[in-house]
Interface confidence: medium
């Protein structure tokens, strides 16, 4: 588990201070100017490395280059949600991790970034376009995720690309539904702004509103907003996997697994006491991702060895800067 | 303890082709990458391709594109370098060596960040 | 294509005595994970090449703790703290960041003065 590093919730002016409108007048700004400035392009990275032990171990680091809180994390085999694949792996920074064999020793490295090792034993099919992804839902900028395809064939038999060919890319939902609250968001926000230039201030006036009713009604929008953009983090794969995943997975899974579009033999049934634990009333993006981990319930991660492939005790280090050598 | 085990030396034409094979024992085969490096008599080590058996995808250097091809039996445990239009240049010993690989999303992609086993490698003459 | 430069080419070493070699890539070979994609390699006469050191500064199974490898970015150094008769050979470092494949250095002969 790790302490999550938080977009600092804002504050609402006290509802007794004015009217119910005065304070939807002042909140939205601060949220959408919030957005505003948090908004940018994220990147997300993904490496893989085969350890160098005779368990022919894979470790799966990924990383999220971006402001925003990270609400969840999957990591997949087989490629992004276009194209299929299945789920290795989930982190949540409250809820905690789930894993499905092979994976093994999934676990946050850093606020954001995760590594997964993976038993080599079960990927014994071979497969020339094996791709790992990562997807990052993290407030405000929406869900994306990056896959790398296993070292291409440089062979001109073979149908892989020359070059290394990384799929970087953000759920079209996130990108066109987050870029267009965002951009209207600072339009309504200088709007707001030119508009409040030119009337008197507000005169401070006890308010008859409960104080309960305009903070949640501030958020509701973004709850909604988020709501909806939420996307399926589990992804099925049809083309190459490892043999082991074609088993069921053995702990179980969430009870939410079975409404995703995963693979038939990979819907695990869970305990029914999951259905029953109630989603967290917040309105927020991280809630709602919570109340869906919530749902899944928690099970202790495999146990094995660690192995490690770098006897360095400072083990590796978070990236930095852009993608690349710096 | 794992070792690679290659074929014996060879004598070649130029403008024909040998294949060398590196048979693996001992350890695990298909997961790890299986590189092919070369030494001229008297020269430093040359990279010439690797393959990752598990996947089956090859990689090779510049220089050899076209020239070279390396294929790997998991069955067998054995992969194979085949270099075909020989010139007197290509007499060297032709080593294979077995490392772990890695890729990433940035576009790094290595056939072996080290090689920690090596074949006893095989001197292939090319003499007309 | 990154070249990796060796010096000195030859190096005549006193039993006992330290030792270093030097090797400068035209290419950082620092990845973003923090590691040094170099490696040290140690042929000796009529043998295969043996691993010595590899990402940059950890010791390969096996060897002996008289070597060590350090250096980031461009430049590396091999260090023998105390030579000893079985170490002669051709060193070479070798760097697996820079895709097509991995470069070799050039090589530096170690011999018994």
């Known amino acids: 588990m790790r302490t999550e590093a938080q977009v600092p919730a804002l504050q609402p002016p006290e509802p007794g201070l004015e009217g119910a409108m005065g304070h939807r007048t002042l909140v939205l700004p601060w949220v959408l100017l919030t957005l505003c400035v948090t908004a940018g392009t994220p990147e997300v990275w993904v490496q893989v490395r085969m350890e160098a032990t005779e368990l022919s171990s894979f470790t799966i680091r990924c990383g999220f280059l971006g402001s925003g809180s990270i609400s969840l994390v999957t990591v997949s085999w087989g490629g992004p949600n276009g194209a299929g694949g299945t789920t290795l792996a989930v982190l949540h920074p409250e809820r905690g991790i789930r894993q499905w064999a092979p994976a093994r020793q999934a676990r946050w490295e850093t606020q954001s970034s995760i590594s997964l090792i993976l038993e080599g034993s079960g990927a014994s099919s071979p497969c020339a376009n094996t791709t790992f992804c990562c997807k990052f839902a993290s407030f405000p900028e929406g869900s994306w995720e990056a896959c790398g395809s296993l070292p291409p064939s440089s062979d001109p038999g073979l149908s892989a690309p020359p070059t290394p060919a990384p799929i970087l890319r953000a759920d079209l939902a996130g990108i066109l539904g987050v870029s267009g609250v965002l951009l209207f968001g600072c339009v309504y926000l200088l709007h707001l702004l030119r508009r409040h230039k030119h009337r008197p201030a507000p005169r401070l006036q006890p308010s008859r509103t409960s104080p309960q009713a305009p903070r949640a009604r501030a958020w509701a929008p973004s709850q909604a907003s988020q709501a909806a953009l939420h996307v399926p983090y589990a992804t099925i794969n049809t083309s190459c996997r490892p043999a082991t995943l074609d088993t069921a997975h053995p702990h179980g899974g969430p009870s939410w697994w079975a409404s995703l579009p995963t693979h038939a033999a990979h819907r695990p049934q869970g305990p029914a006491a999951w259905a029953s634990t109630p989603i967290p009333a917040r309105g927020s993006f991280v809630s709602v991702e919570n109340g869906l981990y919530a749902q899944a319930g928690e099970r202790p991660p495999h146990t094995g060895p660690g192995l490690t492939l770098f006897p360095d005790p400072r083990g590796p280090r978070a990236m930095e800067g852009p993608l690349g050598v710096r | 303890e794992v070792q690679l085990v290659q074929s014996g030396a060879e004598v070649k034409k130029p403008g024909s082709s040998v294949k060398v094979s590196c048979k693996a024992s001992?350890?695990?085969?298909?997961?790890?990458?299986i590189s092919w490096v070369r030494q001229a008599p008297g020269q430093g080590l040359e990279w010439m391709g690797g393959i990752i058996p598990i996947f089956g995808t090859a990689n090779y250097a510049q220089k050899f594109q076209g020239r070279v091809t390396i294929t790997a039996d998991k069955s067998t445990s054995t992969a194979y370098m085949e270099l075909s239009s020989l010139r007197s240049e290509d007499t060297a010993v032709y080593y294979c060596a077995r490392g772990p690989w890695y890729y990433d999303s940035s576009g790094y992609s290595s056939y072996a960040y080290y090689m920690d086993v090596w074949g006893q490698g095989t001197t292939v003459t090319v003499s007309s | 294509d990154v070249v990796m430069t060796q010096s000195p080419l030859s190096l005549p070493v006193t039993p006992g005595e330290p030792a270093s070699i030097s090797c400068r890539s035209s290419?950082?070979?620092?990845?973003?994970?923090?590691?040094?994609?170099l490696d040290w390699y140690l042929q000796k006469p009529g043998q295969s090449p043996q691993l010595l050191i590899y990402?940059?500064?950890n010791r390969a199974s096996g060897v002996p703790d008289r070597f060590s490898g350090s250096g980031s970015g461009t430049d590396f150094t091999l260090k023998i703290s105390r030579v000893e008769a079985e170490d002669v050979g051709v060193y070479y470092c070798?760097?697996?960041?820079?895709?097509?494949?991995?470069?070799f250095g050039g090589g530096t002969k170690v011999e018994i003065k």
């Open positions: 290419q950082s070979l620092l990845h973003s994970d923090g590691y040094n994609y």
């Open positions: 990402l940059g500064s």
């Open positions: 001992g350890g695990t085969f298909s997961s790890y990458a």
């Open positions: 070798m760097q697996a960041l820079h895709t097509p494949g991995v470069t």
